[in-house]
């Protein structure tokens, strides 16, 4: 049965040109983390396996960097970036649990962070 | 045209290593990531590992770890990939094949394949 | 890791025939795989990525099909060309995967 709950960073802002950092925790579970996947809807940015480390989407070099930890950080952000991102963990013995992010890259310099949310 | 183009056949002993290179063209090299992928006579497709030439990241099969090293010399847009300890069970064709553009991890265009034979 | 379980091993066919061949995962990969054929002798070539996105340049009699843990690979009518081993291989956990391969012979 899977136990484990993801704790996210939730609903988060940044201005454009500034960088911000996207966190999941998965908690509640003794399941072994192997991998975790951060997706930007249905596009892969990055991956974090156990045994390879951190693999980085070529689209996304320059503008992603791994950690910390199994976060994620991404820079020189656009309007573009405003979206849904999904961290997937992959674990054993429970399966896959998913984290959702939505973040909003505003023009302005008025970009605060939301409350932080779990989902089960 | 992309073309992956690898070295020729070779025969080593038990306990040898192997050393097979493909170089690539026709495309930008350092915007790829090229895995390694074998097949023993008659066999399926065994995945051994992968290298990002951008920034020299590799990652491994646990299979293969401590006998594999995967290497690139983007002067000549060529990576390589080394194998230890032989075995009479390493003899196979060894393919290098890129990784896609919008996955890296799946493979979009494959080298010839090098048969290793190893014998005593 | 992952288990690609693919069937039939093996198939014989006739030229215009539907051919159906099935991959399943050991867990959910979500739409992460990809489809090779590959004929003696020769590489693998890509066909299907995403489970059902045909590569460029592959004909339209190939389709493939599924999600989670159940795909499938469909060849529409069988053409001569087509007379190969096809491999399924997931790509949504290290390591990657593939299935064991179904060589499709004529009958």
């Known amino acids: 049965m899977m136990t484990g709950t993801i704790e996210t960073t939730g609903n988060i802002s940044a201005e454009k040109g500034g960088s911000i950092i996207l966190q999941c925790h998965l908690s509640s579970t003794t399941a072994q983390v192997t991998q975790v996947n951060w997706e930007q809807q249905d596009q892969l940015l990055a991956i974090c396996n156990a045994d390879l480390g951190w693999h980085i989407s070529p689209s996304f070099k320059d503008r992603v960097a791994p950690g910390p930890g199994l976060g994620l950080t991404l820079q020189s952000l656009t309007v573009n970036d405003t979206g849904e991102y999904f961290c997937i963990y992959h674990t054993y013995p429970d399966g896959t649990y998913t984290g959702r992010i939505f973040l909003e890259v505003l023009e302005s310099s008025v970009a605060e962070h939301g409350a932080r949310f779990q989902i089960p | 045209e992309v073309q992956l183009v690898q070295s020729g056949a070779e025969v080593k002993k038990p306990g040898a290593s192997v050393k097979v290179s493909c170089k690539a063209s026709?495309?930008?090299?350092?915007?790829?990531?090229m895995h390694w992928v074998r097949q023993a006579p008659g066999q399926g497709l065994e995945w051994m590992g992968l290298v990002y030439p951008y920034n020299d990241n590799t990652g491994y099969n646990r299979k293969f770890k401590g006998r594999v090293t995967m290497t690139v010399d983007t002067s000549t847009s060529t990576v390589y990939m080394e194998l230890n300890s032989l075995r009479s069970e390493d003899t196979a064709v060894y393919y290098c094949?890129?990784?896609?553009?919008?996955?890296?991890?799946?493979?979009?265009?494959w080298g010839q394949g090098t048969l290793v034979t190893v014998s005593s | 890791d992952i288990q690609m379980t693919q069937s039939p091993s093996s198939l014989s066919a006739s030229v215009g025939d539907r051919v159906t061949i099935t991959c399943k995962a050991s867990q959910n990969v979500v739409t992460a795989v990809a489809w090779y054929q590959q004929k003696p002798g020769k590489a693998p070539k890509l066909l299907i990525y995403s489970a059902s996105n045909r590569y460029t340049g592959v004909p339209s009699r190939f389709s493939g099909s599924g999600s989670g843990t159940d795909f499938t690979l469909t060849i529409s009518s069988l053409q001569p060309e087509d007379f190969a081993t096809y491999y399924c291989q997931q790509y949504t956990l290290y390591p990657l995967t593939f299935g064991g391969g179904t060589k499709v012979e004529i009958k």
């Open positions: 094949a890129r990784g896609g553009p919008s996955n890296w991890n799946y493979f979009d265009y």
């Open positions: 026709g495309y930008t090299f350092t915007d790829y990531y």
